[in-house]
Interface confidence: low
């Protein structure tokens, strides 16, 4: 079914980081427009991005309603200037997306080291708890709020004068590590959801080193 002059969308791809979720597809339209619909497996279809010439549609507002649901989307193709004109079966061409479960599949965004503080031979490293677009009671939840103990952070740290890395893990947003007195250290963190089978790890945070402005040193 479909019209003679429209082309079905293809390569429907979910792009999602920290629940900011965009559906992308091809081709760039020539004399046609698109409308996107999204649904949970047990719900009704909801239309978004009506009659657009874009090849992407931000579906964040829909998926954050329940990030543990599995979503499907489909992209309808209509001839430009005449969205009522459909094919012999009375339906426009459409293509289905792969399934998408935000909680299991959204990419973990690059974390940021918020601060580090040295007290004697201990250093406390704090990871910024990034805000997501998931709402509860009219407030935006943080990554930790959403994932709870499913989310851990791995800290990589090393002496500035050496390349040998050590690691530490936490299921909070803070690390307390032992360091050698008088040595400067550099740090990088990575977000990890160990229970996942895909998209388990974020990219590493930017490296932060002692002696720079993020840190605080206190001699005891």
């Amino acid at each position: 079914s479909g019209t003679t002059n429209t082309v079905a969308a293809y390569n429907l791809t979910w792009k999602s980081t920290n629940f900011k979720t965009i559906l992308e597809w091809e081709p760039k339209p020539v004399n046609q427009v698109y409308t996107v619909q999204i649904s949970t497996k047990s719900g009704d279809w909801k239309s978004k991005c009506f009659y657009t010439t874009d090849t992407e549609c931000d579906l964040t507002d829909e998926i954050v309603k329940d990030v543990k649901q599995t979503y499907l989307a489909r992209v309808f193709s209509y001839p430009a200037g005449n969205v009522e004109s459909t094919g012999s079966a009375g339906e426009p061409l459409y293509e289905n997306s792969p399934e998408f479960t935000p909680y299991l599949e959204t990419n973990l965004g690059q974390p940021t080291i918020q601060s580090f503080e040295q007290v004697g031979t201990k250093v406390n490293v704090t990871v910024e708890d990034e805000r997501t677009l998931v709402r509860r009671n009219n407030t935006f939840l943080s990554l930790r709020d959403v994932f709870g103990k499913d989310l851990i952070y791995t800290l990589y740290y090393w002496k500035s004068s050496s390349s040998g890395k050590k690691t530490a893990k936490t299921n909070t947003n803070e690390f307390l590590i032992d360091v050698d007195k008088g040595e400067n250290y550099c740090f990088s963190v990575q977000a990890v959801i160990p229970s996942r089978t895909v998209n388990r790890k974020s990219t590493d945070s930017p490296v932060e080193c002692m002696g720079q402005e993020k840190g605080e040193f206190r001699e005891i």
């Epitope: 649904s39 949970t40 047990s42 009704d44 279809w45 489909r74 079966a89 339906e91 479960t101 299991l104």
Partner: antibody, heavy 124, light 107 residues
Amino acid sequence: EDQLVQSGGGLVHPEGSLRLSCAGSGFTFSNYAMNWVRQAPGKGLEWVSTVDTGGSTYYADSVKGRFTISRDNAKNSLYLQMNSLRAEDMAVYYCARDLLVRGALGYYYGMDVWGQGTTVTVSS
Amino acid sequence: EIVLTQSPATLSLSPGERATLSCRASQSVSNYLAWYQQKPGQAPRLLIFDASNRATGIPARVRGSGSGTDFTLTISSLEPEDFAVYYCQQRSNWPFTFGPGTKVDIK
């Protein structure tokens, strides 16, 4: 490879009970609605029951109140508890997965992966 | 419940011929219809979903069409592996019902 492996069939007396199991592998079990379909000897296919991803259950009138469908996503498993079995329940039982979407303009992919089938014989 | 009627009950054809199978619903099922193939001693196999979409791995000679109450499964040129029983199934309303099947056998 996406696969469903069944177990638990056998011979049972009328009014007896039996529990069928179906183990999924190769796919994210919790993402799919799961079904039981049966086929009496020499007959066609008959839908028996569905459990959706949210745990809601649906039954054919012929088994309502006697059969219970359940799932354990942690074990990637589907179950059918059959009580008060009758001669007309004698059939090959298949488990099948599908991607189920209901509602206006909804669609579904159909039952795309099936178990190998298990025979339930009801006889005195 | 929605009753599906399939015709003919048996279709006797030769390899290379065109097979046209019909499925009629007692009330509209929109496009919530699937077709399955079943061979003796085997589990059913999904051919068509959403009335007209071929499932993964199904050859282009198999085609589904129709909407509302009248649906057709067409196999453009029968291969030896196509001789089997074919069932339609509706998912418009609970209970989900199957048709009685059409047997395609070798003439």
